[in-house]
Interface confidence: medium
């Protein structure tokens, strides 16, 4: 029973311990199969370009990394690995400790292995929780919000013997990180007379060329194709002054399951360049293209226990296909096509990234032409399938897109068939000239729940079976609001601290459920929050008919200062949690430590007499116009529809470099409103960019990143996707 | 609380027309429907119609269309119910009742209902 | 219109007893069924919406099961305040239609 370094940790217990012969047996010193054993192992060199899955797949098992109890339990389409370490308080890695899910014990387990490290596959797209335990220590858990077919980098995860509390902290004069990441351009460019010119100065490659004799075929070499030439990234983590009482930076970067850690003493233009060799974390090649995330941390001398962190997607260029197989040369008429990453690789050195060129715009839903109020024929394909009037959209976990068409919810399952699941029902329908009664539709990402925020009845449903059933117009059931008005400084406080259900609401709209279930709707000028024990609270405004105050132009607010004049619309970043709010063409970010930022558009008040708002590559700085809708993709990608309904009609992204720009809908040269010869459907199978919509009501992103918009006045459900090769009945 | 309170018995003379009054109190008017039953001695309930007191929409069952008439005064929060050309088997108890309006889920059934107003008509 | 039928008609029971009365629509109404309670003199009072949904401030000795067109009213055990007049109707299509009623009394 020796406590050899005075951690307060004994015999076996002790991680420090488990290299001495008496703990090699010891179940805590043990961790599950070196996954880059069973990697090589069961590597095959063909093909070179694998799916995420069958790089993965060997990971689970009964005897191997992650432990599986029976039937693998996976979607081979949507599942992610998750990637961690585990350490002491004094940074020892951890072993031993078993990590499992909660709520999935079907997923099974995993236990970290001598340096603390943890491999777990999942179904992604999904938000899920992990749970983490070795004797003597405090059992954590750690809740994730998955993509899919990709690496999650989790943050080191810190085990403590006992609680010990954090003082609260002030955070509200704190500077948030603003990094700059500049990636290594894509190799796209080539020399066309590299005897002249045989640098190419944009990636410093160097490029050289033989002419074959006798023939017109050329053999050309290029150094960006040969396995030392890394892909670089350049972070910028602080700017020429340094926030006050800044004392620490940190810095991570996670690409393809590797994860880089430093920390910087905190002064100014701080910069860093991160190099990747183009391997995952199994040593695997990556071909194509990568999402790297980058976070970037400020810890102040003030607040030693809370890093304030901001991430940032940037994309990394892997390996190339070698299209001849000549030892790094190849011939100029050669070309090979990575299917899979969308590149053409020519034996020129040139390469074309189809899926940089322009997102391509379809019709998944609707026809042109409203069906009738009843529905007869509404489930069946979902292309053609007539729409009535698509007011909401919300993507499922599985990547089924919920559809609110009026007075049915309809569901398009990946299979790309539609099926009813709710009716909605109202007197009130006979009497409407306008179909667009408004309500609106989110995902819980914890368990695949649907809920309906409806304004009309001051009401929050939840969807009772997302298959449909007999029963359409009862398959709902309440879980906010009692129907009864809130009406201003109502002495309950419209139900806060109570039942949501006994809960009164005043006007809900937007709605958008967190990574840990935690439910945010719009109700009137509040945001309100319901939590997972069905308890109601308000996040921000008052009922009180307090002022609007108006929003800081440049500089984070603290919660409890923000008053809203309309907000409509909400969305969870899956990349931080933090949650998004559309408040009269401006776009706000609510962080997990309520901190409230611009995130897009210009309030008026900030805008200077003479400046073209219009104009602005950046969206703090740029104006929005008539926005509807807002939705986040998985890399943080934010995307907001915006319409007039007669001229502008269209769907801009915002980068995580804060750089706005247009995505779909071409500017019309007609009033789609009030001139009825106004052609203002065009454009599917096409650029986005060119394509015309018609009152884009609201907006879904799946964790694919395909951007769904309910075209509502052209009474279809449009997809934008990434420009990618279209493969025939032969895979081919 | 929340309640509807109805106005007093009538005693009409077939042909003529009664006007029944129902004033809510204890909850936003305008957020809820007001359905109207009656109720003959010894027979069971019978819906006569409806009206959302926000838009001012009715519903009325064929039986009655073209004698019945459903108003509100929102500033009052009270609910009308005219029924004309009464004839003896229209003698009964006349309730209004507060149903789920506004609201696509309108099958929530009735919640609070008046006292009644009896009304009887003789000759 | 849809009709209505309730059975039995009437009813007689004791205290504590369990009693299940009827209701029948002429065509499937999914699970847009009320249930009221009516005692002489008095305004009807809901004790089940949708079916199954037990209003709030109802003893839970109240029960309602059934979709399409049969449904059923389930009083688990019967006391002194439950002998009243029971009335389904069905919300799933204007006009609102009642059934006759069932009158539970003494025995």
């Known amino acids: 029973n020796k406590d050899n370094e005075g951690d307060g940790l004994v015999d076996c217990l002790d991680p420090d311990c488990c290299l001495q012969s008496a703990c090699q047996n010891s179940l805590l010193c043990r961790g599950s199969r070196d996954p880059l054993d069973i990697i090589q192992q069961g590597q095959t060199d063909w093909p070179a370009v694998k799916s995420f899955y069958d790089r993965i797949k060997l990971l689970a098992g009964k005897d191997s990394t992650h432990i599986i109890p029976g039937e693998n339990p996976f979607n081979s389409s949507l599942v992610s690995l998750i990637r961690g370490q585990v350490v002491t308080t004094d940074g020892t890695p951890l072993v031993g400790v078993n990590v499992s899910f909660v709520k999935y014990p079907k997923y099974g387990y995993t236990i970290t292995r001598q340096d603390g490290t943890f491999d777990l596959i999942a179904n992604g797209g999904a938000s899920l929780t992990l749970h983490f335990e070795r004797a003597p220590f405090m059992s954590q858990e750690r809740t994730v919000w998955l993509p899919w077919n990709s690496f999650y980098a989790m943050d080191t995860l810190v085990m403590k013997t006992e609680e010990n509390s954090i003082p609260s902290c002030d955070l509200s004069g704190f500077v948030r990180p603003d990094p700059i990441i500049i990636s290594s351009p894509l190799s796209t460019f080539f020399s066309a007379a590299p005897g002249q010119n045989p640098i190419v100065p944009e990636t410093q490659v160097l490029h050289e060329e033989i002419e074959l004799p006798g023939s017109n075929v050329k053999l050309r070499y290029l150094s960006s194709r040969t396995a030392g030439y890394k892909s670089l990234l350049k972070i910028t983590m602080t700017q020429s002054t340094v926030p006050l009482n800044l004392i620490r930076v940190h810095l991570m970067v996670a690409v393809e399951g590797h994860l880089f850690q430093k920390s910087f003493q905190a002064s100014p233009n701080l910069a860093y360049t991160f190099i990747w060799d183009k391997t995952d974390a199994y040593g695997q090649r990556v071909y194509g293209l990568s999402d790297a995330v980058v976070s970037v941390g400020f810890e102040y001398e003030t607040c030693p226990s809370l890093i304030l962190w901001e991430k940032r997607t940037a994309l990394l260029q892997g390996f190339e296909l070698d299209p001849s197989n000549l030892g790094g040369w190849s011939l100029d008429k050669h070309h090979i096509l990575n299917v899979k990453s969308g590149i053409l690789h020519k034996g020129t050195g040139e390469n074309q990234f189809l899926t940089q060129q322009p997102a391509i715009i379809t019709s998944i839903m609707g026809n042109g032409r409203r069906r009738s109020i009843s529905c007869p024929s509404c489930n069946g394909l979902a292309e053609g399938n007539k729409l009535l009037a698509p007011v909401a959209l919300a993507v499922g976990i599985d990547g089924s897109l919920y559809v609110g068409d009026f007075n049915y919810i309809r569901r398009i399952f990946p299979s790309r068939n539609v099926t009813s699941i709710l009716e909605l029902r109202n007197k009130e329908f006979k009497h409407s000239n306008n179909p667009a009664h408004k309500y609106y539709l989110a995902v819980d990402p914890v368990s695949g729940s649907l809920y309906v925020s409806d304004t009309n009845s001051r009401r929050i449903y939840r969807v009772k079976s997302l298959s449909g059933t007999k029963d359409l117009a009862g398959n709902s059931e309440v879980v906010a609001g009692t129907g009864e008005q809130c009406l201003p400084f109502d002495e309950a406080r419209c139900g806060d601290g109570g039942k949501a259900i006994d809960a009164t609401l005043m006007s809900p709209r937007g709605i958008a459920v967190d990574k840990n279930g935690l439910m945010y709707f719009v109700d009137a000028t509040m945001i309100r929050k319901v939590d997972q024990n069905g308890i109601i609270s308000t996040l921000l405004g008052s009922n009180d008919l307090t002022a609007v105050r108006p929003l800081s132009c440049d500089s984070s607010m603290d919660v409890a200062q923000v008053r809203l004049e309309w907000p409509t619309d909400l969305a969870v970043n899956p990349m931080d949690n933090s949650l998004y709010v559309l408040e009269n063409n401006v776009i706000l970010r609510i962080t997990e430590n309520h901190q409230v930022s611009i995130i897009a558009g210009r309030p008026m008040h900030c805008q200077v007499p003479g400046i073209d708002y219009s104009l602005s590559k950046l969206a703090i700085h740029s104006a929005l116009e008539s926005a509807s809708a807002i939705a986040i993709s998985h890399t943080g990608v934010l995307y907001i529809t915006e319409t007039d309904e007669k001229k502008i009609n269209r769907l801009r992204q915002v980068t995580t470099n804060g750089e706005i720009c247009l995505l779909a809908g071409a500017a019309s040269d007609c009033d789609c409103k009030n001139d009825v010869n106004c052609n203002c459907y065009s454009g599917d199978d096409a650029y986005a960019t060119d394509a015309i919509l018609n009152s884009p009501s609201s907006l879904a992103v799946a964790p694919d990143g395909t951007i769904y918009i309910a075209d509502l006045g052209n009474i279809r459900i449009r997809a934008v996707s990434k420009n990618k090769p279209v493969l025939n009945a032969f895979n081919q | 609380q929340v309640q509807l309170v109805q106005s007093g018995a009538e005693v009409k003379k077939p042909g003529a027309s009664v006007k029944v009054s129902c004033k809510a109190s204890?909850?936003?008017?305008?957020?809820?429907?007001i359905n109207w039953v009656r109720q003959a001695t010894g027979q069971g309930l019978e819906w006569m119609g409806w009206?959302?007191?926000?838009?001012?929409?009715?519903g009325y069952a064929q039986k009655f269309q073209g004698r019945v008439t459903m108003t509100r005064n929102t500033s009052i929060r009270t609910a009308y119910m005219e029924l004309s050309s009464l004839r003896s088997e229209d003698t009964a108890v006349y309730y209004c009742?507060?149903?789920?309006?506004?609201?696509?889920?309108?099958?929530?059934?009735?919640?609070?209902w008046g006292q009644g107003t009896t009304v009887t008509v003789s000759s | 219109d849809i009709q209505m039928t309730q059975s039995p008609s009437s009813l007689s029971a004791s205290v504590g007893d369990r009693v299940t009365i009827t209701c029948r629509a002429s065509?499937?109404?999914?699970?847009?069924l009320n249930w009221y309670q009516q005692k002489p003199g008095k305004a009807p009072n809901l004790l089940i919406y949708?079916?199954?949904s037990l209003q709030s401030g109802v003893p839970s000795r109240f029960s309602g099961s059934g979709s399409g067109t049969v449904f059923t009213l389930t009083i688990s055990s019967l006391q002194p305040e439950d002998f009243a007049t029971y009335y389904c109707?069905?919300?799933?299509?204007?006009?609102?239609?009642f059934g006759p009623g069932t009158k539970v009394d003494f025995k």
């Open positions: 009742a507060r149903g789920p309006g506004g609201s696509f889920y309108y099958y929530y059934g009735m919640d609070v």
């Open positions: 009206m959302n007191p926000n838009s001012g929409n009715t």
């Open positions: 949708t079916a199954s």
């Open positions: 204890g909850y936003t008017f305008t957020n809820y429907d």
């Open positions: 065509q499937s109404i999914s699970s847009y």
């Open positions: 109707q069905q919300s799933s299509s204007t006009p609102f239609t």
